[in-house]
């Protein structure tokens, strides 16, 4: 008699990434009987919530419920109804909410309260909303990419699942760039992690990992831009800021109140004789790069070596996956190819930034002007951060892999977060059974 397949025995999980600039909902799926196996969880859906990050709802908290509706309804459609009550939902808020909490714990709590109340109305198993730490964000990003790359699996494969996958069990480092913070996480080579705050110990699938991580708050691409503007306006002779990080011919009016709204610009705050100023782009990569370097304090280091601002950074080791805005920006600039050297990237950035704004708008007519205008800054910032901030060199640049997805799942902290909260990464290596008999009768 022919074997008949039983109904698919699968589980689902939902994670909302409440970032500083937007919120994304991810739906994950895995075979129920293989929960402890490595690499079985995969992303089946990403839904980007329309609108800004949740921290921007402080003055319009009543709109949070509507804001989340479309993506939560999408989750209701994607996940079979019979599974709704068993499907956990987690919301993790990152640096945008960390900054709001720094300004006012009460306001941050109010936003999270309304977020939780709104999400609890859906038929899922809502497990709460919380602001994750920068250390968690780094750690879960590292877990995600290494889980998806099969680095925790004891079985070495004779084939490669992704183009840049090396066939050994050495883990990839993780480089994550958001709007308000950036994380660097990797396993250093036989190096003591000199600052306890940056040290993580994991036991995953029977193997111990000593991991370095740091999250630089205010050094995400959006907050770094606010920092740069606040720094540069200090020395402007009038309300015109000639800015090398924007294309020639670009003009934009900025409110001083908006500039000083974020805690990230507090160190540059001063009384200005105007309420508004105008950015006038001059499109010069080299000058832009120099201006960005002034955001990194490299004059002080209490350790054997530092990244910047006195933060310990061990010597870089192995390959790195650079994801989130590292990927989105470089993808837009067409610079994600493994074959593009650091020198070539720099050359292309010089050309891109020098292009007139009118020309750029014509070439990229479908792109929102707000985003389009900032690619010169963002690309330059990525180079500055990786080279001067984290000490990558022209040689080690080839060890950076700009990653959007791995086997269909987005690179980012959300998968690692869910794997941890659902206890799907065992400390010990599970006993492998030759065959699972649960699928066929």
């Amino acid at each position: 008699t022919q074997n008949k397949a039983l109904p698919e025995n699968v589980k689902y999980g939902i994670v909302l990434d409440a970032g500083s600039s937007h919120t994304s909902l991810y739906i994950y799926k895995w075979p129920a009987e293989k929960e402890n196996d490595t690499g079985v969880v995969h992303q089946v859906e990403e839904c980007r919530v329309k609108g800004p990050g949740i921290s921007k709802f402080v003055q319009k908290v009543n709109e949070i419920g509507i804001y989340l509706t479309d993506c939560m309804e999408r989750a209701r459609e994607v996940i079979p109804r019979s599974q709704h009550q068993e499907t956990p939902v987690y919301l993790g808020a990152t640096a945008g909410m960390r900054l709001l909490r720094m300004e006012s714990e009460e306001l941050a709590d109010r936003v999270l309260d309304v977020v939780e109340r709104s999400l609890s109305n859906y038929p899922f198993d809502f497990q709460g909303a919380r602001i994750i730490t920068g250390q968690e964000e780094g750690a879960y990003g590292w877990i995600t990419i290494n889980y998806l790359l099969g680095k925790f699996s004891q079985k070495t494969r004779w084939f490669s699942i992704v183009p840049y996958e090396t066939n050994n069990q050495e883990t990839f480092g993780a480089l994550d760039l958001g709007g308000a913070s950036t994380q660097v996480t990797f396993v250093p080579q036989n190096q003591t992690i000199e600052s306890p705050d940056n040290a993580l110990q994991f036991r995953l699938y029977g193997k111990d990992y000593n991991v370095y991580t740091h999250s630089f708050l205010c050094y995400g691409k959006d907050q770094a831009l606010w920092q740069k503007l606040a720094k540069d306006i200090q020395v402007a002779s009038n309300e015109i800021l000639r800015d090398p990080c924007f294309h020639p011919g670009y003009k934009k009016v900025v409110n001083v109140s908006d500039l000083y709204k974020t805690p990230c610009t507090k160190r540059f705050e001063m009384t200005l004789p105007f309420q508004q100023f105008e950015i006038q782009g001059i499109g010069n990569y080299q000058q832009c790069h120099q201006s960005i370097l002034e955001l990194f304090n490299t004059s002080y280091c209490p350790y054997s070596q530092c990244a910047f601002n006195g933060i310990f950074l061990p010597p870089l080791q192995g390959d790195f996956g650079a994801f989130s805005a590292f990927y989105f920006v470089m993808k837009f600039l067409n610079l994600t190819s493994e074959k593009v050297s650091q020198e070539k990237v720099t050359e292309m950035m010089k050309k891109f930034c020098a292009q007139p704004w009118e020309e750029i708008k014509t070439s990229y007519a479908g792109v929102k002007e707000k985003y389009l205008s900032e690619y010169c800054f963002s690309g330059t910032y990525i180079l500055s951060l990786l080279l001067q901030g984290y000490h990558f060199t022209a040689d080690s640049w080839e060890h950076i892999h700009f990653i959007g997805k791995i086997q269909g799942s987005d690179a980012g902290w959300t998968l690692g977060y869910m794997l941890n909260l659902t206890n799907m990464i065992p400390a010990e290596q599970p006993l492998s059974t030759p065959l699972s008999h649960s699928t066929y009768v």
Epitope: V61, N62, I64, G65, E106, D109, R110, L112, D113, V114, E116, R117, S118, S120, F126, Q127, G128
Partner: antibody, heavy 119, light 107 residues
Amino acid sequence: QVQLVQSGAEVKKPGSSVKVSCKASGGTFSSNAIGWVRQAPGQGLEWMGGIIPAFGTANYAQKFQGRVTITADESTSTAYMELSSLRSEDTAVYYCARDPVRRSPFDIWGQGTMVTVSS
Amino acid sequence: EIVLTQSPATLSLSPGERATLSCRASQSVSSYLAWYQQKPGQAPRLLIYDSSNRATGIPARFSGSGSGTDFTLTISSLEPEDFAVYYCQQSFLWPRTFGGGTKVEIK
């Protein structure tokens, strides 16, 4: 000192609806949340739902979703709980209670409203 | 949802004795657990919040402890007015849930 004063007892027929009010006095109403909890005769306490009047954000226990509506009127500092399609099992004392901040308990309670559902 | 299990269901004690009431959660509620006292015909009254903090006006004989999944309410020396039903409630996750109650009665 904040006080919550609820409307009087009600007797209702099965299939009908009941609307219980909860008026706050002596303190800020809008920024706090108001929760609704019921207690059937001789039974324990059961959370039904809640609202933050300032934002109109309401949430409900899955058991009551589609049958309960919680609203608030900031101008009169009053919260309302309407339960429809009443059945005999809905006979209970309905309490409103203040829930001042995120993840806080119910620190101030109304006196309760007895709702009897009988044909 | 989080299930709270209270034990014992009934506690028969004499005035002056120590009462120990237990509340166990089906998953961690961190320290977001409250205790209420309810007397016949009255609304519940908040005694303890965040596991161990006494609410305003609550006598020092009432104390709470625990975190995660196991919590205890202790009444160090029972007064005649303490004989009532006690409920625990978690405010960590929605929906808010209550334990089934422990009745403290006079022996």
